[in-house]
């Protein structure tokens, strides 16, 4: 491991600070944990692919960026990063691919500057509802998190608890309304079948939402109305069949939105007429000329933008007496 020192070439001190009466102490010389690489100038500690089973206790106080990727952490207990003095500077924490299957309540407590958290590629069978909020109060202290990256955190089928995975994740996102300041949320590649209807309404600051590569069939009960800051919505590679009028109107009403809809199995029947009309008029869908029908068979690979109302028919439903076996 390397531990660059704050040699005679640089000098740290507590400067005049006009906005606060708190006096900051000069940081003490910091050691680099075993099996880690440290750069004080980059305020970065990398403990990568080291098969660590727990978070190092002797992290330097200067750390702003902490990479703990490719390890074997298994469980993040409460206060996993709590230190004396606290890691007051830690802003970006990457725990991806570290075989985490349990994140307990308060795992990220005592990290007052944590802005970006990446838990991707961990099989999170047990994500506490209070993993991010830290307490079970109905309204918690606001989390400083601005970006939360939770791509591919779905555990294998046989390791899931007897509960909805979507529900478990959403409970953690909504607990205590702690994540009201969240601006980026990535939930790609999680086999989500649905999006609980209340989740987006309680994340009003979202700018970027990535739900790509899931199994979402419908957005009928999902409201985007409150997401007035939303800039990008990634819905590629899902199982969407059609977007209905209510959803279309809400998306159109968002002032900065860009929507990505590629690689969904669009069903081009009479229910698609409103969406086709909207696609022809809207500027919010990126790459809209690439959207093609998947069903019915006769419509496969037809470009949505090239369809007209005559193309979009529904086979009549025969009354029971006329149906043949």
């Amino acid at each position: 491991s390397s531990s660059p020192t704050s040699s005679a070439s640089s000098f740290s001190s507590s400067a005049p600070f006009l906005a606060s009466a708190v006096s900051a102490q000069p940081p003490l010389p910091d050691q680099c944990p075993a099996l880690c690489e440290c750069s004080e100038a980059a305020r970065t500690v990398k403990c990568v692919n080291r098969n660590l089973t727990e978070v190092p206790t002797d992290l330097p106080a200067y750390v702003r960026n902490l990479f703990l990727t490719g390890n074997q952490l298994a469980v993040l207990p409460a206060g996993a990063f709590a230190r004396r003095p606290p890691l007051a500077e830690l802003a970006a924490l990457n725990l991806s691919g570290s075989r985490l299957d349990e994140v307990r309540a308060g795992a990220f407590e005592h990290l007052p500057s944590l802005r970006q958290l990446d838990l991707s590629h961990n099989p999170l069978a047990d994500l506490s509802p209070f993993a991010f909020s830290g307490s079970n109060a109905s309204v918690s202290a606001p989390s400083p998190l601005v970006e939360l990256i939770l791509n591919h955190i779905v555990p294998p089928e046989d390791e899931r608890q007897n509960r909805s995975f979507e529900g478990m994740v959403v409970a953690a996102l909504l607990a205590g309304r702690a994540l009201q300041g969240l601006r980026r949320l990535e939930l790609a590649s999680n086999h989500f079948l649905y999006l609980p209807r209340d989740v987006l309404a309680q994340l009003p600051s979202l700018r970027h939402l990535d739900l790509s590569n899931n199994s979402l069939v419908s957005l009928t009960y999902v409201s985007f109305r409150n997401l007035t800051h939303l800039e990008s919505l990634h819905l590629e590679d899902n199982a969407l069949k059609v977007l209905h009028n209510g959803t279309l109107a809400e998306l159109q009403g968002l002032p900065h939105i860009r929507v990505f809809l590629d690689n969904n199995p669009w069903v081009c029947d009479c229910h698609m007429a409103d969406m086709v009309t909207w696609l022809k008029e809207t500027e919010v869908v990126q790459g809209k000329d690439r959207l093609t029908c998947a069903y019915p068979e006769k419509m496969r690979n037809r470009v949505l933008l090239e369809l007209n109302s005559a193309d979009l028919d529904c086979d009549p439903i025969l009354p029971p007496s006329l149906q043949t076996s």
Epitope: S2, P4, S6, S7, S9, S10, S12, S13, S14, A15, P16, F17, S20, V22, A24, P26, P27, E37, S39, E40, A41, A42, R43, T44, R64, N65, A88, E89, A91, A92, S113, R115, Q116, V146, E147
Partner: antibody
Framework: QVQMQESGPGLVKPSETLSLSCTAS????????MNWVRQSAGKGLEWIGD????????TYNQKFKDRASLSVDKSRNWASLRLASVTAADTAVYYC???????????????WGPGVQVTVSS | EIVMTQSPDTLSVSPGETVTLSCRAS??????LHWYQQKPGQSPRLLIK???QSISAFPARFVGSGSGSEFTLTINNMQSEDVAVYYC?????????FGQGTKVDIK
Amino acid sequence: QVQMQESGPGLVKPSETLSLSCTASGYTFTDFYMNWVRQSAGKGLEWIGDINPNNGVTTYNQKFKDRASLSVDKSRNWASLRLASVTAADTAVYYCATGAIHYGYDGYFDVWGPGVQVTVSS
Amino acid sequence: EIVMTQSPDTLSVSPGETVTLSCRASQSISDYLHWYQQKPGQSPRLLIKYASQSISAFPARFVGSGSGSEFTLTINNMQSEDVAVYYCQNGHSFPLTFGQGTKVDIK
């Protein structure tokens, strides 16, 4: 978008104190370290030091530590550099810069002010 | 302090050519090496971070490589708008230090 703007006198007399300020906008000021870098024909780009706007902790290049003083006023998204006892060798363009597109401070600068030319002369 | 040395000091190339700029650190800095482009009368702009990570504002013809103490910036298919001074920067150890720059212009 993220912007920085330096200001200060373009001419300073030898032995006096150079005083510059930098106003930042378009991001959360306390999230990112503020750096000062100068550029002169003779010495190229030189990093003077940085300050954490959250707590006022500074790190200085040893070359400047006895003469430089950095401070911030986070209520005004404002940072300042004072450089004492200047000589003609301190004639340079002075920049404030930050890493404000990314959350961790990573020892590089992706947002720079336009710079302010300072000449030390009597 | 870590001394950054760039070579050559100046380079004159024809449009469409490939340009190779070198940067050497006086000791290992892992991949904490950043490149900047500075055009006349402008501030430096971050071009490549961490030795090889591109910045979206710049075209893909700018490619960084290297690790440890030897680094290279390659400009493929040189264009007239690439005329500038290119600086490398140590981001590993305090004080942060820059190379003296390589000036690239068109023949």
